[in-house]
Interface confidence: low
């Protein structure tokens, strides 16, 4: 019997979380020609393996090297789609634009998308009544270390011209706190990368403003700028009709041009 | 860097109580074990109870049960053990000990505070 | 309650020498116990967690082996600094208890 109760502040293990990150790994292997090779109960062990038996605020980015190692996958240059508090927008487009990709379109993010997980130190067993909340707990808990050790590998192996959507309804069009913001901006290589393009997604139906002028967004102009990697800035105006002209791009209303340029 | 910065020395009558406080710094108070262990003069080490401070949860070694208090106030990241009915025997260093914990309550202790000494003495 | 009892209770050993520490558990404690070196004047610090995993920022030369009940701690090559004296804890069972403690003295 439990003589003290592990309570955290976030909420616990999504249920069902082996299963569901085992039916993944076996959907995508069978979708994805490539990762044909990839055995899912070896995948399952190393995530299992991460953090089964960790006290969750001790977790680190050496805990995931095993499973990152077996799910090692390439992005074609000028593939790579990063995203900022926009994931809903971004996945819809990568779903029409088959030949780009987010983070979740890969393997290890597609197993990990919108579950949460944690175990307990010493004992075998998976929490599911509570995990370390990042804010009100710590930083360094299961899912947010797999994250960051995700993102900055997925940043690493980028190549050529790399697009980023940002959220331009939120105060922080660019946020240095942000996955985006701390871990894929300085892991970009910029022996690799020649240019990083943002895309800056406007919510409101009447807005023309040029959020490519925000301060935020000169100030990843400037950081980026300063890693040698070239920066380049575009307003949607539109996302409805962006994912519309995505779709299709034959659309006589799309022909146009849809896209508000500035190139800096 | 993770602090545990203990209160100073006392001296106590017998029969009398006193409370030592554990004020921590550098890390998150609230996701850690507090415990407290004692050594007498020459001896070893021997750990009387703890406190979750995020859930207010406490357990003693049976030695102690019904003399020790823990209490945590989260507010300050200060933790609390409070020994009544003393007798010489309690003279001792006491050391609050941070630890991380499951829900079986196994820890270790990764952080120290410099320690208390109390003295019961008539 | 478990009963740790280590030895031996002083040990003599010359500065780069090997020094090997037991303990034992009156019963299996399975690999949930620690190691704490004390100076005189100072709190206890952790060395090894897990019967063998080093606490950060431990240098190599300390290692820990053994489950169940028969445990050891090894320091390699005894520095100036490592003279002092060391515990063992079990936290597999309720109260966790330490060892009496092995003193590490220069010979």
């Known amino acids: 019997v439990p003589r003290w109760r592990q309570q955290w502040s976030g909420s616990g293990t999504t249920s069902r979380f082996p299963e569901t990150v085992l039916a993944r790994c076996v959907k995508y292997t069978e979708v994805h020609p490539e990762m044909r090779h990839v055995d899912c109960q070896s995948v399952w062990d190393a995530f299992k393996g991460a953090f089964i038996s960790k006290y969750p605020c001790n977790i680190t980015e050496e805990d995931y090297q095993p499973l990152v190692k077996l799910g090692t996958q390439t992005v074609p240059c000028n593939k790579t789609l990063l995203w900022s508090r926009i994931k809903d927008l971004a996945h819809q487009f990568t779903q029409v634009q088959r030949d780009m990709f987010t983070l979740e379109d890969m393997l290890l993010g597609y197993l990990a998308d919108d579950l949460t997980w944690c175990g307990e130190f010493n004992t075998f067993e998976i929490n599911y009544q509570s995990c370390p909340d990042w804010r009100k707990d710590c930083s360094n808990n299961p899912v947010s270390v797999f994250w960051k050790t995700v993102s900055r590998r997925f940043a690493e192996t980028a190549c050529g011209v790399v697009h980023v959507m940002l959220n331009g309804s939120r105060s922080k069009i660019f946020d240095k706190n942000s996955t985006f913001g701390s871990v894929e901006v300085h892991n970009l290589q910029p022996e690799k990368v020649q240019a990083l393009e943002a895309w800056v997604i406007h919510g409101g139906r009447e807005d023309s403003r040029d959020l490519c002028q925000d301060p935020t967004i000169k100030e990843l102009e400037s950081i980026i700028s300063k890693r040698n990697i070239r920066f380049f800035c575009k307003n949607i105006y539109r996302p409805d009709k962006f994912l519309q002209c995505v779709k299709n791009p034959e659309d006589s209303s799309c022909l146009s041009g849809i896209h508000h340029h500035h190139h800096h | 860097q993770v602090q545990l910065v203990q209160s100073g020395a006392e001296v106590k009558k017998p029969g009398s109580s006193v409370k030592v406080s554990c004020k921590a710094s550098g890390g998150s108070f609230s996701i850690y074990a507090i415990s407290w262990v004692r050594q007498a003069p020459g001896q070893g080490l021997e750990w009387m109870g703890g406190?979750?401070?995020?859930?207010?949860?406490?357990d003693y070694a049976q030695k102690f049960q019904g003399r020790v208090t823990i209490t945590a106030d989260e507010s300050t990241s200060t933790a609390y053990m409070e020994l009544s009915s003393l007798r010489s025997e309690d003279t001792a260093v006491y050391y609050c000990?941070?630890?991380?914990?499951?829900?079986?309550?196994?820890?270790?202790?990764?952080?120290w505070g410099q320690g208390t000494l109390v003295t019961v003495s008539s | 309650e478990i009963v740790m009892t280590q030895s031996p209770a002083t040990l003599s050993v010359s500065p780069g020498e090997r020094a090997t520490l037991s303990c034992r558990a009156s019963?299996?404690?399975?690999?949930?116990l620690a190691w704490y070196q004390q100076k005189p004047g100072q709190a206890p610090r952790l060395l090894i967690y897990?019967?063998?995993t080093r606490a950060t920022g431990i240098p190599a030369r300390f290692s820990g082996s053994g489950s169940g009940t028969e445990f050891t701690l090894t320091i390699s090559s005894l520095q100036s600094e490592d003279f002092a004296v060391y515990y063992c804890?079990?936290?597999?069972?309720?109260?966790?208890?330490f060892g009496q403690g092995t003193k590490v003295e220069i010979k």
């Open positions: 897990g019967a063998s």
């Open positions: 804890q079990q936290y597999n069972n309720w109260p966790w208890t």
């Open positions: 000990a941070r630890g991380p914990y499951d829900s079986y309550g196994e820890s270790y202790f990764d952080y």
């Open positions: 406190i979750i401070p995020n859930s207010g949860d406490t």
């Open positions: 019963q299996s404690v399975s690999s949930n």
